[in-house]
């Protein structure tokens, strides 16, 4: 499976969905980590299919929601949120798989100034 960011690049303060694409229908659990791999990277949040529950991790800020399809919604993103995010899945056979996507965040332009100008 793959991870796609919608939108691919978002201004700070906006919401971004990290969409899990082409995922198996037999997933028992989803775990989102901040980093290029799940191993050794802090857990943001998980979703357990059986009990239909979100599980907050050590890196959970309160702005993240994992949906039953495995996608991760970021609300009110900040520049610090930019980076790599890895989704680890566990299927009905207890096999684990993972994929990594990128969250790109850009600064809001100051109203009235052309792009590239610096507010004094």
């Amino acid at each position: 499976f793959t991870i796609e960011a919608l939108p691919s690049s978002a201004a700070e303060g906006k919401d971004v969905l990290l969409l899990a694409c082409n995922i198996s229908e037999t997933i028992q659990a989803y775990y989102w980590h901040k980093g290029k791999t799940a191993e050794g990277s802090p857990l943001i949040a998980g979703y357990i299919t059986d009990i239909q529950a979100n599980i907050p991790g050590a890196a959970y800020s309160g702005r993240e929601t994992v949906y039953p399809n495995g996608s991760l919604l970021f609300q009110n993103i900040t520049l610090e949120d930019a980076g790599s995010y890895t989704l680890r899945t566990i299927n009905a056979s207890y096999d684990s798989d993972q994929a990594t996507g990128q969250l790109h965040v850009h600064q809001n332009n100051v109203p009235g100034l052309p792009v590239g100008a610096v507010a004094g």
């Epitope: 028992q28 659990a29 775990y31 857990l43 998980g46 357990i48 009990i51 529950a53 599980i55 991790g57 566990i90 207890y94 684990s96």
Partner: nanobody, 118 residues
Framework: QVQLQESGGGLVQAGGSLRLSCAAS????????MGWYRQAPGKEREFVAG???????YYADSVKGRFTISRDNAKNTVYLQMNSLKPEDTAVYYC????????????WGQGTQVTVSS
């Protein structure tokens, strides 16, 4: 290592009740869910009910309003009160302990047979 021992299964008529118990030996983390799954002949094992250390309960839609799960943390025991049983509830019922943060690491009991006759 956690070991699970179920009891309370049996044969009951439709509309009747049964109470399953599952005693766990070993250390269970506070992030674990204790619960019940079932497997009917020729079907896959399915979630029935679960309960957290803090007694948050979770139920499959098919048993809501009929089954009640409870937990005694001091005794490391989980119970499943099954009322208004239906023939389609017939299955082997398995006790399970699963950690929310390591869901693929599960402990399972041997199972207890529940048969509901019409």
């Amino acid at each position: 290592q956690v070991q699970l021992q179920e009891s309370g299964g049996g044969l009951v008529q439709a509309g009747g009740s049964l109470r399953l118990s599952c005693a766990a030996s070993g250390t269970i983390s506070r992030s674990s869910i204790m619960g019940w799954y079932r497997q009917a002949p020729g079907k896959e094992r399915e979630f029935v009910a679960g309960i957290s250390y803090g007694s948050t309960t979770y139920y499959a839609d098919s048993v809501k309003g009929r089954f009640t799960i409870s937990r005694d943390n001091a005794k490391n025991t989980v119970y499943l009160q099954m009322n208004s049983l239906k023939p389609e509830d017939t299955a082997v019922y398995y006790c399970a302990v699963r950690d929310l943060y390591v869901w693929d690491h599960a402990y399972w009991g041997q199972g207890t047979q529940v048969t509901v006759s019409s």
